[in-house]
């Protein structure tokens, strides 16, 4: 019950954090105008990983598009990347894990092969939410320097007539749904891999023989009900009908009352 | 026809208050920001603050604070402007404008003419 | 706040001439995030609210006819208007739109001969 639990709660917080991380991808707030002294502006310039804004005190707001490539700094690029790493792996960690979980029946998939499902999501959930997380920082880190570099330049002078007051930009509502989005994708795989250890078979000293009670064809298993782990048991109580002794390894798994921890 | 009308003239003593409207129709009035801009005889412009019909949020030019409250009554589409503790340089002629596209005033009302004399 | 000088503060021409004027701002009202210049041509005729005729420095407002021609980037800009028309005496504005407070030009007093 606890690995379901486990299992199910990480599938959930990953998939939040991964639709925050595909979120804030999408999102033009990455960097903002910073508004220092001024909390009213009659021109409010926000930056997003594919266009820039332009919002109007009257209301209007135009937005336009990097129609570019080459023309953008490597940083940029760098970090559409990393988010691009981070959603396309945590996809592919959340169709993964569908298959993985414990309440979910596909035909006679074997625990060990949903184990190996389990862990597989959880590393793509953490290597996703690493991806987002990266991205987001060198980003904050590129703000960071910009910021400091423009706040030294503030004023250009020219001729000490002419002020150009030069544009700050802080940090965007999208950062930090970023760093909370690819926390949760990172604390839902190591969920995941938690999971997993619970959802392997567990390695027995011996091999458990069936034996046949004359005039009935009920199994005696020793060691049938182990006392539980905490992370789930493959020894399942099994009618044999085919008179023929097996060991335990052989046995397939399917779900009984005893299913619980 | 989007029309600002505003309220007719004003002769007021000095030290006294007097309170300005500005009638709007013909479009959405918490759309747009309302601005007020006073003109000196023979003068030029000068921005005195905005509000929001939508938010009631309001700007004040540094110079006019304290000096002008800006109000508004949603139902009635009107925004008002209050000015206090006349003295006879407040005599003017107040405008409201209606804010659009480039932070520009598209829409001007016919403007109140204010004296403000013993 | 932004202080904006226009020259000069009055001319005298003849109908059918063309005229320029010019509006410089103490800082740049170009706008780095859309390339946009934020600044406001207004006319204003005796007994009358003034009335827009170019906004973003260049942009004619709509009902505007096209002898008015608004230029300029940063600093300096220039409203002209190609042919003068009788009816185009007044005295002409220009706002900063880039920053409030919201400042305006002392204004180009156009007559005609």
């Known amino acids: 019950m606890a690995v379901t639990a486990c299992q199910g709660l990480g599938f959930v917080v990953s998939l939040i954090g991964i639709a925050g991380i595909i979120a804030a991808t999408c999102m033009d707030q990455w960097s903002t105008q910073d508004l220092y002294n001024n909390p009213v502006t009659a021109v409010f310039n926000y930056q997003g990983l594919w266009r820039s804004c332009v919002r109007e005190s009257s209301g209007f707001t135009e937005c336009r598009g990097y129609f570019t490539l080459l023309g953008l700094p490597a940083m940029l690029q760098a970090v559409r990347a990393l988010m691009i790493v981070g959603i396309v792996l945590g996809a592919i960690g959340l169709l993964v894990s569908i298959f993985a979980l414990k309440c979910i029946r596909i035909g006679s998939m074997e625990d060990s092969a949903k184990a190996n499902m389990t862990l597989t999501s959880g590393i793509m959930f953490i290597v996703s939410g690493l991806c987002a997380i990266a991205g987001v920082s060198v980003f904050a880190n590129m703000l960071v320097t910009n910021f400091w570099m423009s706040t030294a330049n503030m004023y250009t002078g020219m001729g000490g007539m002419v002020q150009t007051v030069q544009t700050r930009y802080t940090f965007g509502a999208a950062l930090f749904v970023g760093w909370v989005a690819g926390g949760l994708t990172l604390i839902g795989g190591v969920m995941m891999c938690i999971a997993c250890r619970g959802l392997a078979p567990e390695e027995t000293n011996y091999k458990a023989v069936s034996y046949h009670a004359s005039g009935h064809s009920v199994a005696y298993k020793p060691g049938g009900f182990k006392a539980s782990t905490g992370f789930g048991s493959n020894t399942k109580n099994k009618k044999i009908y085919d008179g023929g002794a097996r060991t335990e390894d052989e046995v397939q798994s399917y779900p009984s009352k005893h299913d619980y921890v | 026809e989007v029309q600002l009308q505003e309220s007719g003239a004003e002769l007021v003593k000095p030290g006294a208050s007097v309170k300005l409207s500005c009638k709007a129709s013909g479009y959405i009035f918490t759309s747009y920001w309302m601005h007020w801009v006073k003109q000196r005889p023979g003068q030029g412009l000068e921005w005195i603050g905005m509000?929001?019909?939508?938010?009631?949020?309001?700007n004040y030019n540094e110079k006019f604070k304290g000096k002008a409250t800006l109000t508004l009554d949603k139902s009635s589409s009107t925004a008002y402007m209050q000015l206090s503790s006349l003295p006879s340089e407040d005599s003017a002629v107040y405008y409201c404008?209606?804010?659009?596209?480039?932070?520009?005033?598209?829409?001007w009302g016919q403007g109140t003419t204010l004296t403000v004399s013993s | 706040d932004i202080v904006l000088t226009q020259s000069p503060s009055s001319l005298t021409v003849t109908a059918g001439e063309k005229v320029t004027m010019s509006c410089k701002s103490s800082?740049?009202?170009?706008?780095?995030?859309?390339?946009?210049?934020?600044l406001t041509w207004y006319q204003q005729k005796p007994g009358q609210p003034p009335k827009l005729l170019i906004y973003?420095?260049?942009t004619r407002e709509s009902g505007v006819p096209d002898r008015f021609t608004g230029s300029g980037s940063g600093t300096d800009f220039t409203l002209t208007i190609s042919s003068v028309q009788a009816e185009d005496l007044a005295i002409y504005y220009c706002q900063n739109a880039y920053t409030y407070p919201f400042t305006f030009g002392s204004g180009t007093k156009l007559e005609i001969k």
């Open positions: 509000i929001h019909p939508n938010s009631g949020s309001t």
């Open positions: 800082q740049s009202l170009l706008n780095s995030g859309n390339q946009k210049n934020y």
């Open positions: 973003w420095a260049s």
């Open positions: 404008a209606r804010l659009k596209t480039g932070n520009s005033f598209d829409y």
